[in-house]
């Protein structure tokens, strides 16, 4: 089956004809399967010692692992990651704002391992088990 | 400035050039800003009263709106939202399998909106003010 | 509460120097900066300079050579101090504060007339 | 130093009116703009800042929305108190710039 963009996902749904398309069993999974996918991420998560200060923008598109494994079991994590360096406005209170450089680590590449504990059904993770 | 695919961010930093490359100012900015993007989100998320059941894949991947909006004062909220219909499988303990269609809700027009109390700040939003 | 006050004369010769006193209360000027803006009669708003927080200070191109703005941290004063006034200076000079965005409060205004 | 146009300078509107007032930056300024409110005699107000962060005390019939180089000021219902003048200011690059202002008038 060709693949289908999921911003088209919400238009074929809603297309008007009486016949709702589906989206194949197929295209399902194989969005939904571990990979390395776009995730905004707070900058003072990464550097929350810089917590009094604000950044411009707030957050960073980064890609990490996520997805689902297809065994409760397993789940999705990173097993090679790149450093990515992005220039952002740092505002002091009061001050004058700045450029800075910051560098945040991406998931390159992502895989489906076991849960250290084979306990905690984990149905969907964000490279980190659900509880 | 070009934009560049965030697959490749972390590549152009480990070139293996003494310089890093550091993605400029205007492509963070445009890349973080409140819009509609891929997740993937647990099935018994959407569906609880099915948690009972499993479900392959246990997540699908949906488009919700989540960026930043440049003030901790605003947060990214859906204004536009479409059904989108996919084929699962459902697992019942001990039983066979079965296919089914479920119904999702995806986020197709973002906007920044005033967070209701101008207090709390909200540095990265996934349309949800961060406590 | 937070307040700024201005104080500073409402008549000035021609040639002479302009000089504004914004004194704050209810905040730090270690924290926020202070910005200096001008209305003259009939105009818009116009943006002349700024004491940030750090003390670094920030001019519009038109006026560099002819402001400056200075601050004393321990008094929450800051100073506004232009020179070689003319007539079209006249009009009404405001401070306001600034943390991370808009100005969010401003000084009573100080009205100034150019005449001899 | 980057521009700040105000499409209209004045507009004639009646009490309970939807009034959208525009502004446009010469460049691209990420959301650091702001509205303000004057009234005569009286200093601006700010009312809204990072392109539609309603400050405290501002009546939520204000409303901002906007990015990249065009911005705008909504009133949903326009009270009698809302008669003023209403400027536009971008604060990504010294110099901060102001718009020319647009007044409102009841008709």
């Known amino acids: 089956l060709p693949a289908v963009p999921p911003q088209q996902w919400a238009l074929s749904a809603g297309n008007g004809s009486s016949e709702v398309e589906v989206v194949p069993f197929q295209e399902v999974w194989g969005r939904s399967y571990c990979r390395a996918l776009e995730r905004l991420v707070d900058v003072v998560s990464e550097y929350p010692s810089e917590v009094e200060h604000m950044f411009s923008p707030s957050c960073v598109s980064l890609l990490r692992c996520t997805g689902c494994c297809g065994d409760e079991n397993l789940h999705c994590v990173p097993v090679e990651t790149a450093n990515v360096t992005m220039q952002l406005l740092k505002i002091r209170s009061g001050d004058r704002p700045s450029y800075v450089e910051l560098t945040f680590s991406q998931h390159v590449r992502c895989e489906c391992r076991p849960l250290r504990e084979k306990m905690k059904p984990e149905r969907c993770g964000d490279a980190v088990p659900r509880r | 400035l070009p934009a560049v695919p965030p697959q490749q961010w972390a590549l152009s930093a480990g070139n293996g050039s003494s310089e890093v490359e550091v993605v400029p100012f205007q492509e963070v900015w445009g890349r973080s800003y409140c819009r509609a993007l891929e997740r993937l989100v647990d099935v018994v998320s959407e569906y609880p009263s099915e948690v009972e059941h499993m479900f392959s894949p246990s997540c699908v991947s949906l488009l919700r709106c989540t960026g930043c909006c440049g003030d901790e004062n605003l947060h990214c909220v859906p204004v536009e939202t479409a059904n989108v219909t996919m084929q699962l499988l459902k697992i019942r303990s001990g039983d066979r399998p079965s296919y089914v269609e479920l119904t999702f809700s995806q986020h197709v027009r973002c906007e920044c909106r005033p967070l209701r109390e101008k207090m709390k700040p909200e540095r990265c939003g996934d349309a949800v003010p961060r406590r | 509460q937070v307040q700024l006050k201005q104080s500073g004369p409402g008549l000035v010769q021609p040639s002479q120097s302009l000089s504004i006193t914004c004194t704050v209360s209810g905040f730090s000027l270690t924290t926020y900066g202070i910005h200096w803006v001008r209305q003259s009669p009939g105009k818009g708003l116009e943006w002349l300079g700024v004491m940030w927080s750090g003390g670094d200070t920030d001019y519009d191109a038109a006026f560099i050579s002819r402001l400056s703005i200075s601050k004393d941290n321990s008094k929450s004063q800051v100073f506004f101090k232009m020179n070689s006034l003319q007539a079209n200076d006249t009009g009404i000079y405001y401070c306001?504060?600034?943390?991370?965005?808009?100005?969010?409060?401003w000084g009573q205004g100080t009205s100034v007339t150019v005449s001899s | 130093a980057i521009q700040m146009t105000q499409s209209s300078s004045s507009f004639s509107v009646s009490l309970g009116d939807r009034v959208t007032i525009t502004c446009k930056a010469s460049e691209d300024i990420y959301n650091r703009f702001a509205w303000y409110q004057q009234k005569p005699g009286n200093a601006p107000r700010l009312l809204i800042s990072g392109a539609a962060s309603l400050e405290a005390g501002v009546p939520s019939r204000f409303s901002g929305s906007g990015s990249g180089q065009d911005y705008t000021l909504s009133i949903t219902s326009l009270q009698t108190e809302d008669v003023a003048t209403y400027y536009c200011q971008q604060y990504w690059s010294t110099p901060w710039t102001f718009g020319g202002g647009t007044k409102l008038e009841i008709k």
């Open positions: 306001a504060r600034y943390r991370f965005y808009g100005m969010d409060y």
